[in-house]
């Protein structure tokens, strides 16, 4: 069987939801020594980056300027060390937002509920769309989808303090082209039977997995490794 290198990790820097006309940045994290990284869009080659020097960095960033609906879709990346190519990364869905109109989000019975009550979010957008999306701040990967002509409902089971947080919704014109976000609705859940101090609260910072963790191998790292090796010999 043909030998391949481990698949790289593809990430969106800051967020995979990019407002139209803004720049998207995708990171492809492979390995030190990779001489070439390729970004593929919907299965076709989209861009190529060659790190300099390749042995000192474990990935690259691909900048996609002027985001629009034609650039929104599924991205993946691969890398090469010498003549050997890696497996393809997982697919990353890149979404363009701020298309057309702004939906309105409301919540029943209201933004302040008691633990155990059932809650339903309503997202409404008068312009033609059929899919609606509900996202919780700090949990943007957990997208709930619902369908309707001008509005959609997002029922939630009996709520707990884990449901606390800020929610926004989008209308979707296709899987990768979303409307402007609604104004946020902050859901406050009170009166949990169990100890509420142990309930998870939402981070106010962006999703931790939407960060590029590319590292440079520095001279200092090499010096430390050499020092460690010398120290081991001395101890012997």
């Amino acid at each position: 069987p043909k030998q391949t290198l481990p698949k790289p990790i593809i990430r969106a820097e800051s967020t995979y939801m990019v407002p139209k006309e803004k720049q998207a940045t995708l990171c492809c994290q492979g390995s030190y020594g990779a001489v070439e990284y390729q970004l593929h869009f919907e299965g076709s080659l989209f861009a190529v980056e060659r790190p300099k020097p390749p042995e000192r960095i474990n990935g690259v960033k691909f900048h996609i300027p002027d985001m629009n609906s034609r650039k929104a879709g599924r991205y993946s990346c691969i890398y090469r060390v010498g003549e050997l190519w890696s497996e393809r990364s997982d697919l990353l869905d890149l979404v363009v937002t701020e298309m057309y109109d702004t939906p309105t989000l409301s919540v029943h019975p209201g933004p302040e509920v008691t633990s155990g009550e059932k809650v339903t979010f309503y997202c409404r957008l008068d312009t033609a769309t059929s899919m609606f999306l509900l996202l919780k701040e700090g949990r943007s990967r957990d997208v709930q989808r619902s369908y309707g002509k001008v509005q959609a409902e997002f029922p939630m089971g009996p709520v707990t303090t884990a449901h606390r947080g800020s929610y926004r919704c989008f209308g979707s014109y296709n899987n990768y082209a979303w409307s402007f976000p609604s104004e946020p609705v902050k859901l406050l859940v009170t009166g949990d039977i169990e100890n509420t101090s142990l309930a998870p609260t939402d981070p106010t910072f962006p999703d931790s997995w939407d960060t590029c963790l590319l590292t440079r191998e520095t001279g200092l790292q090499k010096d430390l490794a050499l020092w460690d090796h010398t120290a081991q010999n001395l101890l012997r």
Partner: antibody
Amino acid sequence: QVQLQQPGAELVKPGASVKLSCKASGFTFTNYWMHWVKQRPGQGLEWIGMIHPNSGSTNYNEKFKSKATLTVDKSSSTAYMQLSSLTSEDSAVYYCAGGGRLDYWGQGTTLTVSS
Amino acid sequence: DIQMTQSPSSLSASLGERVSLTCRASQDIGSSLNWLQQEPDGTIKRLIYATSSLDSGVPKRFSGSRSGSDYSLTISSLESEDFVDYYCLQYASSPFTFGSGTKLEIK
């Protein structure tokens, strides 16, 4: 204090339409769901539907979808329910209620459909 | 639709007596249940929301509780103005549905 004002009575002919009103005061009208409920003489209560004045989102009881249309006028803090193609079956007291949990209730409008 | 089975349909009791009314939900409604009071002139007032939360201005003799799919309204010591009609209402799932009502009569 919170008040939901409804006209006491309406008399309309069969086949006609009527628009019932519910004027809200004492709370921020745009922030709260407005519900409509039907009660036939000597009978129980039936939920018709609700509307959110700020978003315009509505939710209807399937049974009343072709009968009732809910609207609001934010400038006057008034909720409306239009009932169409009226028959004697529509003769009832109609209540509006404010708040997601039907927190506050109007006094009700007695609708009589008669020729 | 969620059915709310309310019992009893009528209840005769004496002043000072403790009474309980029950509603059984046909599906899970969590704690999304109200108890309403309707006077003979048609005036409707909410007494309890979210199963057990007492509305402001409602006397402490009224209380709400839950056991599984059974929801109860208890009046600890009946007073003369309590002899009216009572309804439960689930607001968990559309269409919201009411119990058929309980007429509380003086013995």
